[in-house]
């Protein structure tokens, strides 16, 4: 859930007031706010559906909710990409699409979403509780991944509800000079704002509404999402084919769009460098990668002179790491 | 820099079979899909199928589904193609490509002859 | 499995001129989904592999001439080179990106007068 914040307007102290020093500490902070509060984090969604007619055919959904390009999709099983998980299909935008057995179509809803299905016939079908993971990589945001299973419970027919992926992986991949000075920014602002706590407060003048109001995006989940996130973690069955993961299942909820928060801790890593994090008390892992992603063996999405976002496989023209196209 | 090496040539008779290799280097081998395709001297090219290392399974033009076996080795990073019962109609450069043909072999030339 | 066809399969030209070459598909390379061609060009000069020049019908691979210019949308498409080069001699083919089996054109030859 997104929400709108609007961040006051710093009235000019008086001059001579606080000097050069004292206006740069006024106009510092109030940069670095605005950086924070604009870095918004992007969300991945993932849905997971069992055909009536087909009982071991699976159609996964996925969609990236970010303002960056996306410039490669891959869909894997039995875990996120690269952890354990097998690539099933590798959406580019521009390049094409490819698919490996059991996928039988996989294919671009919008822009942002894509769609996979799965026929279950032999040794590589799906089961119920197989985990689905699906990884956006887009510009300049990184990679996102965020994976889903079917509730073990789940009629043939129904759809798992989009609520918060069991297994959220971000790849912090865009810009780590960025994201450095970001989160430099904002320890230095918190540093900033505790050391003026005992001076007087600078006038503040409420900003008009505009459409520059920078956005602050909060993570709220809805019930359906607090109550999926709280389901204690569960040991998948591992006689299904692809290995899988011990992963919550979320359980029923309202909506079958709820988005899945792909919320990650900036965690200063090596490029490459995975850290899983259980968090028990909701049910999920985080995984955070940071790193130059060069578009592995992909063409690069337009990131201008220097900088190229690198999933391997020609990622579709695909990235560096598990996946790739191109 | 990501490279693609394969053998300059293998000679063949008629009714045997060719395993032919496309080594990797440069790039991490289980992230992108190697593609195989056929040239026939003075033809055009056509596209035999593809195979992801990552999760070793194939797609294969349906022309090509009794004639070529696609496998890969991650160890070593090379992917293989075997064409079996091979007739004068085999006789081609045979090229793989990483990914989206971003990169390209330089090409195996497999004469059928007896 | 989708045909495509290239004309002319051969031209000769002098350098410095204008060269433009078609390929038609015969069913739609469009993806309905995010409106993007599924077709790409490729460069082939003798006794070499092929060499990626375009991509999604109209974007240039990374390290391609800018005289190279893809355009068209569904079925019909065209390769542009603005000013032939002596080094472009080579063969082109169009290549359905769009759906397996990933067919190629018959290519279509250019020669330099």
């Known amino acids: 859930m997104r929400t709108e914040a609007q961040v006051p307007a710093l009235q000019p102290p008086e001059p001579g007031l606080e000097g050069a020093m004292g206006h740069r500490t006024l106009v510092l902070p109030w940069v670095l706010l605005t950086l924070c509060v604009t870095a918004g984090t992007p969300e991945v969604w993932v849905q997971v559906r069992m055909e009536a007619t087909e009982l071991s055919s699976f159609t996964i959904r996925c969609g990236f909710l970010g303002s960056g390009s996306i410039s490669l999709v891959t869909v894997s099983w039995g875990g996120p990409n690269g952890a354990g998980g097998t690539t099933l299909a590798v959406l580019h935008p521009e390049r094409g699409i490819r698919q490996w057995a059991p996928a039988r179509q996989a294919r671009w809803e919008t822009q942002s979403s894509i769609s996979l299905i799965l026929e279950g016939s032999g040794a590589s079908s799906p089961c119920a509780n197989t985990t689905f993971c699906c990884k956006f990589a887009s510009f300049p945001e990184g990679s996102w991944e965020a994976c889903g299973s079917l509730p073990p419970s789940s009629d043939p027919g129904l759809s798992a509800p989009p609520t918060p992926a069991p297994i959220l992986r971000a790849d912090l991949a865009g810009i780590l000079g960025v994201s450095g000075v970001l989160l430099f920014g904002c320890v230095y602002l918190l540093h900033l704002l505790r050391r003026h706590k005992h001076r007087p407060a600078p006038r503040l003048q409420p900003s008009r509404t505009s459409p520059q109001a920078p956005r602050a995006r909060a993570w709220a989940p809805s019930q359906a999402s607090q109550a999926a996130l709280h389901v204690p973690y569960a040991t998948i069955n591992t006689s299904c084919r692809p290995a899988t993961l011990d992963t919550a299942h979320p359980h029923g909820g309202p909506s079958w769009w709820a988005s899945l928060p792909t919320h990650a801790a900036h965690r200063p890593q090596g490029p490459a460098a995975w850290a899983s994090t259980p968090i028990p008390a909701r049910g999920s892992f985080v995984s955070v990668e940071n790193g130059l992603y060069a578009q592995a063996g992909e063409r690069p999405p337009h990131t201008g002179p220097g900088l190229t976002l690198f999933p391997d496989p020609r990622g579709p023209r695909a990235m560096e790491g598990p996946l790739g196209v191109r | 820099q990501a490279q693609l090496q394969q053998p300059g040539a293998e000679l063949v008779k008629p009714g045997a079979s060719v395993k032919m290799s496309c080594k990797a280097s440069g790039y991490t081998f289980t992230s992108y899909w190697i593609t195989w395709v056929k040239q026939r001297p003075g033809q055009g090219l056509e596209w035999i199928g593809d195979i992801y290392p990552g999760n070793f399974s194939p797609n294969y033009n349906e022309k090509f589904k009794n004639k070529a076996t696609l496998t890969v080795d991650t160890s070593s990073s090379t992917a293989y193609m075997q064409l079996s019962s091979l007739t004068s109609e085999d006789s081609a450069v045979y090229y793989c490509?990483?990914?989206?043909?971003?990169?390209w072999g330089t090409g195996t030339t497999v004469t059928v002859s007896s | 499995d989708i045909v495509m066809t290239q004309s002319p399969s051969s031209l000769s030209v002098s350098a410095g001129e204008k060269v433009t070459m078609s390929c038609k598909s015969s069913q739609s390379l469009l993806n309905s989904g995010n409106q993007k061609n599924y077709l790409a060009w490729y460069q082939q000069k003798p006794g070499q592999p092929p060499k990626l020049l375009i991509y999604?019908?109209?974007t240039r691979e990374s390290g391609v001439p800018d005289r190279f210019t893809g355009s068209g949308s569904g079925t019909d498409f065209t390769l542009t080179i603005s000013s032939v080069q002596a080094e472009d001699l080579a063969v082109y083919y169009c290549?359905?990106?769009?759906?397996?089996?990933?067919?190629f054109g018959s290519g279509t030859k250019l020669e330099i007068k």
């Open positions: 999604g019908a109209s």
């Open positions: 290549q359905n990106d769009h759906s397996y089996p990933f067919t």
């Open positions: 490509a990483k990914g989206y043909f971003d990169v």
